[in-house]
């Protein structure tokens, strides 16, 4: 991908809710020169990607659970 493509936010919008069972992994991108806000990008079990609302309590729980399962593996 070109540098121009990468230096921008990757989330067009955010899903307000998603069932954790559909999520394979979660990538939390901190704010930086490419994007002013935190982005939570979930890889779904069907191979698609989805952006989640980092302020959502459900999403916070999902991130916490994923990070904990990563630590235990």
């Amino acid at each position: 991908a070109s540098v121009a493509t990468e230096l921008r936010c990757q989330c067009l919008q955010t899903l307000q809710g998603i069932h954790p069972k559909n999520i394979q992994s979660v990538n939390v991108k901190s704010p930086g020169p490419h994007c002013a806000q935190t982005e939570v990008i979930a890889t779904l079990k069907n191979g698609r990607k989805a952006c989640l609302n980092p302020a959502s309590p459900i999403v916070k729980k999902i991130i916490e659970k994923m990070l904990n399962s990563d630590k235990s593996n």
Epitope: S2, C11, L12, Q13, C51
Partner: antibody, heavy 121, light 111 residues
């Protein structure tokens, strides 16, 4: 089930304005971006741009800046495409398509049935 | 803009045979390990139907007679075996960057 239903065909004269609608159902309308695609008779597909259904912010492809406007009525789960000062070359079928939330989206799985706009004096 | 060049513009294939359609992008559509190339089928009077997303993933409800492959700039849609209802126009589309672009289309006819 997820559906996008568009308004019916329109016959207009050059210089007039047309506004076509696309109503989403079966999903949370404000979760997903909405895109518009033009197909002139017997031709291929051309992406016109998209509207953020959370914020209402539109993004237009270069060829569709100026006379074209995307808008929303979120309470009715409906997106609109308005074309001002119609020209003969605007004669086409216009499709709405539900996009994703990730910039590198994986294609449009849901489309409206299309709205034919015919422009003729 | 990323230009997508489809070939051939049209092809005629016998029932049960293989149809192969190529799509070449003017620059890479890869990002973060994925290739953002999608394939659609369109029949007259109907909207396009998504067949393949992210180069090789079969959309839900699409028969396994359709498959996609490729990365970077070179992509292929295969249909095997070709069935009667596959007569249509096929488009590739990149979703790597704005403006999103489509190939000019390949018309598949049955011999």
């Amino acid at each position: 089930q997820i559906q996008l239903v568009q308004s019916g065909p329109e016959l207009k004269k050059p210089g007039e304005t047309v506004k076509i609608s696309c109503k989403g159902s079966g999903y949370t309308f404000t979760d997903y971006s909405m895109h518009w695609v033009k197909q002139a008779p017997g031709k291929g597909l051309k992406w016109m741009g998209w509207i953020n259904t959370e914020t209402g912010e539109p993004t237009y492809a270069d060829d569709f800046k100026g006379r074209f406007a995307f808008s929303l009525e979120t309470s009715a789960s409906t997106a609109y495409l308005q074309i001002n000062n119609l020209k003969n070359e605007d004669t086409a079928t216009y499709f709405c398509a539900r996009g994703g939330v990730y910039r590198y989206d994986e294609g449009f799985a849901y489309w409206g049935q299309g709205t034919l706009v015919s422009v003729s004096a | 803009d990323i230009v997508l060049t489809q070939s051939p513009a049209s092809l005629a294939v016998s029932l049960g045979q293989r149809a192969t359609i190529s799509c070449k992008a003017s620059q890479s559509v890869d990002y973060d390990g994925d290739s953002y190339m999608n394939w659609y089928q369109q029949k007259p009077g109907q909207p396009p139907k998504l067949l393949i997303y992210a180069a090789s993933n079969l959309e839900s409800g699409i028969p396994a007679t359709f498959s996609g492959s490729g990365s970077g700039t070179d992509f292929t849609l295969n249909i095997h075996p070709v069935e009667e209802e596959d007569a249509a126009t096929y488009y590739c589309q990149q979703s790597h960057e704005d403006p999103l672009t489509f190939g000019a289309g390949t018309k598949l006819e049955l011999k």
